[in-house]
């Protein structure tokens, strides 16, 4: 039975050219986190694996940095980075937990952070 919840940074916005941290946190479960995938729509950005550490997709290695923790840092943001991002927690024995973050990259310098929210 899956008892955990994923808390994410929710809906966030950031300035073009800047950077942003995408963060998810899995709580309320004792399951082992054996791998975390970060995806943008259907593209795999990065993997953090229990045995192999962090691996960043070569397509994104210049603009994506691992961490902090199991989060992901996006740099040199462009308006094309606007969209949905998913953290996918592969756990044992629970299974897979998924968190969603919506990032909006703004031209202006008025970038506000949305509230945190939970996904069961």
């Amino acid at each position: 039975m899956m008892t955990g919840t994923i808390e994410t940074t929710g809906n966030i916005s950031a300035e073009k050219g800047g950077s942003i941290i995408l963060q998810c946190h899995l709580s309320s479960t004792t399951a082992q986190v054996t791998q975390v995938n970060w995806e943008q729509q259907d593209q795999l950005l990065a993997i953090c694996n229990a045995d192999l550490g962090w691996h960043i997709s070569p397509s994104f290695k210049d603009r994506v940095a691992p961490g902090p923790g199991l989060g992901l840092t996006l740099q040199s943001l462009t308006v094309n980075d606007t969209g949905e991002y998913f953290c996918i927690y592969h756990t044992y024995p629970d299974g897979t937990y998924t968190g969603r973050i919506f990032l909006e990259v703004l031209e202006s310098s008025v970038a506000e952070h949305g509230a945190r929210f939970q996904i069961p």
Epitope: Q32, T34, P58, H90, P93
Partner: antibody, heavy 122, light 107 residues
Framework: QVQLVQSGAEVKKPGSSVKVSCKAS????????ISWVRQAPGQGLEWMGG????????NYAQKFQGRVTITADESTSTAYMELSSLRSEDTAVYYC???????????????WGQGTTVTVSS | DIQMTQSPSSLSASVGDRVTITCRAS??????LNWYQQKPGKAPKLLIY???SLQSGVPSRFSGSGSGTDFTLTISSLQPEDFATYYC?????????FGGGTKVEIK
């Protein structure tokens, strides 16, 4: 079922390099990772590094950083481990092992190659 | 790196004996621990993952327990084919590290 078949034994001179191959059959190469583990004569197991073929990226144990290069060729389902600047202490059996990715990542190294003996001697 | 210490380094036992091998981590690793069996001239074989889950095809006489820093591999009734060296491995902190091994010999 997945099998990993490694290249044959090698005898090398100190200061030279060795490249060991590990060919996978019977599974989807892109759905798992490959680790390399070595074992010196009469000693325990030592993790050297691993690669995720879908990215072609590798991470290494600090002890081997700068001296080991792990690569993978998805078209032939083969992983490679190259160790340079060989010294006598590198005499060992070198194993490749499969690591699951994604929802089966909890298993650890569940399929191993037969091992490749590398002897470093002048 | 996390240090994994196994004890004893070797033991002698008879067929039918109950055998216990311990593994201690230098810091807490939760239950991110695997056990492997290796016979002379052969590759290691995964026995137990996640500290206590039995790998498919492994006889039920093998069991694992523990969490945090202290772990145990138990063979409830030693069989002739169990004489081998056993290794624990942590996968909580990169890089993965192995214990020094415990050789189980025939008494």
């Amino acid at each position: 079922q997945v099998q990993l078949v490694q290249s044959g034994a090698e005898v090398k001179k100190p200061g030279s390099s060795v490249k060991v191959s590990c060919k996978a059959s019977g599974g989807t190469f892109s759905s798992y990772a490959i680790s390399w583990v070595r074992q010196a004569p009469g000693q325990g197991l030592e993790w050297m590094g691993g690669i995720i073929p879908i990215f072609g990226t590798a991470n290494y144990a600090q002890k081997f950083q700068g001296r080991v290069t792990i690569t993978a060729d998805e078209s032939t389902s083969t992983a490679y481990m190259e160790l340079s600047s060989l010294r006598s202490e590198d005499t060992a059996v070198y194993y490749c092992a499969r690591l699951h990715l994604g929802s089966s990542a909890y298993y650890g190294m569940d399929v191993w190659g037969q091992g490749t003996t590398v002897t470093v001697s002048s | 790196d996390i240090q994994m210490t196994q004890s004893p380094s070797s033991l002698s036992a008879s067929v039918g004996d109950r055998v216990t091998i311990t593994c201690r981590a230098s810091q807490s690793i939760s239950s991110y621990l695997n056990w492997y069996q290796q016979k002379p001239g052969k590759a290691p074989k995964l026995l137990i993952y996640a500290a206590s889950s039995l790998q498919s095809g492994v006889p039920s006489r093998f069991s694992g327990s523990g969490s945090g820093t202290d772990f145990t591999l138990t063979i409830s009734s030693l069989q002739p084919e169990d004489f081998a060296t056993y290794y624990c491995q942590q996968r909580y902190v990169f890089p993965p590290t192995f214990g020094g091994g415990t050789k189980v010999e025939i008494k």
